[in-house]
Interface confidence: low
């Protein structure tokens, strides 16, 4: 390999290098390639040089296109007709000179926040592109259509957010925003101007006409209407708060809808329980006033007893199933009927037949094994399932089992 590279001179974007050739293994060196490494690069990377192609008799080159105020080390690799040799030992580490920053923050945007706030956000400029010490940002903003920019200097390279808080900021009003950069060398460019909206005012009126109904022992459906009066805050959706009668309101659970949906289903509730519900409109500024509270009691839980004593027999291409009636307990919803679920052994999707009797006749081909289960249903929902019954593939026309 060539002997270690020496850095003879370094500027903000260039480095003058020299090296001494190593042994050529009896095949003349035809070219050298310069590689560089920084704390920010993944391993060694080839770099641009002047001259662009370094022949085997040239032992100096200028590396160009470096980033200012970044620590570099360099090495050289020799090549001949046989192939590429071992790289030289790295040079010492040297930092390029400082320069004015040239890269502006990406994705300047913002919005949201609390009342009377303008929130401005951006992606920070990576350290290797800051071009010097003392890096920071200049945030410029003005109400849309106004002449004068307001400026704030943020003396921190990590800054990615600025909040302007002032009573004069009207809710959800547009501002022109741009973010510039600076370092110890001076000011760099600004990002392109973008429009960011100040924080909204939360909705000022409650939803109207709240109505709730129990769907089962575990589910409630809630309905409401948009606020009747003119609402100052934009509505992004609604928040439904619900809590059990024996609980405190502060322990309530909340679910949110998005958009202009004016109903929602609340699931995973307990049976025979009185629930209180209230609805609020919300937006990015917060929630508005609460509607009046409405009450709803979930239905009694479904029967806990599964159908028992299931007997089946088959004739022709029919399977006839019989089972014992399920009796609901006092605190359970009465049985309205039964669901018979069946599927082929090899098939994942299940078919369902509903009946209000304690027997059912299934017309099924006999060239498959069947898996069958039965469960009662009620106003409170589906009850407990029987154990799965496997009815084997039947070759003869008559069979029975239990």
């Amino acid at each position: 390999p060539p002997e270690a590279v020496t850095i003879d001179e370094i500027t903000d974007t260039t480095a003058q290098l020299s090296w001494r050739p190593g042994p050529d293994n009896h095949s003349p060196i035809t070219m050298y390639v310069i590689q560089a490494r920084t704390p920010f690069s993944v391993g060694w990377q080839a770099v641009s040089t002047v001259p662009e192609l370094i022949d085997g008799k040239t032992f100096t080159a200028t590396v160009v296109g470096l980033n200012p105020w970044v620590e570099y080390e360099f090495r050289t690799v020799a090549a001949n007709v046989i192939g590429i040799g071992e790289p030289s030992r790295p040079s010492e580490k040297r930092r390029t000179e400082e320069a004015l920053p040239e890269v502006t923050p990406a994705n300047v945007s913002g919005g949201g926040g609390s009342k009377s706030e303008l929130v401005i956000t951006w992606e920070t400029v990576p350290e290797e592109l800051q071009n010097g010490r003392g890096f920071g940002y200049v945030v410029a903003f003005r109400p849309y259509g106004k002449m004068i920019w307001m400026l704030t200097v943020l003396a921190s390279a990590d800054a990615s957010r600025y909040v302007f808080r002032n009573e004069s900021v009207h809710p959800f009003s547009p501002f022109e925003v741009k973010v510039g950069v600076f370092n110890n060398k001076g000011e760099g460019p600004f990002s392109p101007t973008t429009v960011v909206y100040s924080a909204e005012e939360e909705p000022t009126k409650p939803p109207a006409s709240i109505f709730a109904r129990s769907l089962s022992a575990t589910d409630i459906e809630v309905f409401w209407a948009s606020p009747l009066e003119k609402n100052r805050g934009r509505i992004q959706g609604y928040e439904v708060k619900y809590w059990r009668h024996e609980d405190k309101e502060e322990n309530a659970r909340k679910i949110r809808t998005v958009g202009n949906q004016t109903s929602t289903k609340i699931t995973n509730l307990k049976g025979s329980v009185l629930y209180h519900l209230a609805v609020k409109a919300y937006n990015s500024a917060g929630t508005g006033p609460s509607s009046a509270t409405v009450n709803v009691t979930t239905r009694k839980p479904p029967p806990s007893q599964p159908p028992g004593n299931i007997i089946w027999n088959s004739s022709d291409s029919k399977i006839i199933l019989n089972w014992d009636q399920v009796k609901a307990l006092d605190n359970e919803s009465e049985v309205k009927g039964y669901k018979v679920l069946y599927r082929w052994n090899r098939q994942s999707s299940t078919s369902v037949i509903e009946t209000n009797k304690t027997s059912v006749e299934l017309s099924l081909p006999f060239d498959e094994d069947y898996i069958i289960e039965i469960k009662p249903f009620s106003d409170g929902g589906d009850g407990s399932s029987s154990e799965q019954i496997r009815i084997p593939k039947i070759s003869n026309a008559y069979a029975r089992g239990s």
């Epitope: 949201g112 926040g113 609390s114 009342k115 945030v139 704030t152 200097v153 943020l154 003396a155 921190s156 800054a159 957010r161 600025y162 909040v163 808080r165 002032n166 500024a285 917060g286």
Partner: antibody, heavy 123, light 101 residues
Framework: EVQLLESGGGLVQPGGSLRLSCAAS????????MFWVRQAPGKGLEWVAE????????WYAPAVKGRFTISRDNSKNTLYLQMNSLRAEDTAVYYC????????????????WGQGTLVTVSS | ELTQDPAVSVALGQTVRITCSGS???YGWYQQKPGQAPVLVIY???NRPSGIPDRFSGSSSGNTASLTITGAQAEDEADYYC?????????FGGGTKLTVL
């Protein structure tokens, strides 16, 4: 190194007044929002008041609004808290504090605190 | 109002999570040892100031912020406060006393 040194605490009777001062050094004082935060004996932190870098905007906790006034003298690198109509529940250690960045405000971003000065309101 | 659990304990070297719920969009976390002023350990939900060990980390989801200490040390025993802005005023949580067992 940022340093904040409070003074002016002491014993005062209910209804009385007190003025706290906080001498700041080690940073560009006029660039940063400043705060007063208090802590009653054995209790948690309570934000009291805040003032913008230039002094043009002030914010107060509901419990002190109308009784306390936060101000600053950027030429002297000093923060003040004028406390009037003091009550027993104002008894606390009062900390002077600084926002983390020139653009930060609020109790989410205090990066430097003084050692505090004790205010006792008792008859 | 920001709500914190009053007390949490953790075995030495284990991970502990302290939560803070309220309406702040941006939370900070402070460590306070007896007789000392508080110290900022997390700002803007997830950022760690220089000098704070990397076992401290912050996260935020919805209206809840969390401070996680991964591999708690004896010196981490302290009161921890969250701070934020609730839409009308700056507030601190009631504090969580962390005991390292």
């Amino acid at each position: 190194e940022v340093q904040l040194l409070e003074s002016g605490g002491g014993l005062v009777q209910p209804g009385g007044s007190l003025r706290l001062s906080c001498a700041a050094s080690g940073f560009t004082f006029s660039s940063f929002n400043m705060f007063w935060v208090r802590q009653a004996p054995g209790k948690g932190l309570e934000w009291v008041a805040e003032i913008s870098g230039g002094g043009g905007s002030t914010w107060y906790a509901p419990a002190v609004k109308g009784r306390f006034t936060i101000s600053r003298d950027n030429s002297k690198n000093t923060l003040y808290l004028q406390m009037n109509s003091l009550r027993a529940e104002d008894t606390a250690v009062y900390y002077c504090a600084k926002s983390r960045d020139t653009w930060s405000y609020g109790a989410a971003t205090i990066d430097a605190w003084g050692q505090g000065t004790l205010v006792t309101v008792s008859s | 109002e920001l709500t914190q659990d009053p007390a949490v304990s953790v075995a030495l070297g284990q991970t502990v999570r302290i939560t803070c719920s309220g309406s702040s969009g941006s939370y900070g976390w402070y460590q306070q040892k007896p007789g000392q002023a508080p110290v900022l350990v997390i700002y803007d939900n997830t950022n760690r100031p220089s000098g704070i060990p990397d076992r401290f980390s912050g996260s935020s989801s919805g209206n809840t912020a969390s401070l996680t200490i991964t591999g708690a040390q004896a010196e981490d025993e302290a009161d921890y406060y969250c701070g934020g802005y609730d839409g009308s005023t700056d507030v601190f949580g009631g504090g969580t006393k962390l005991t390292v067992l």
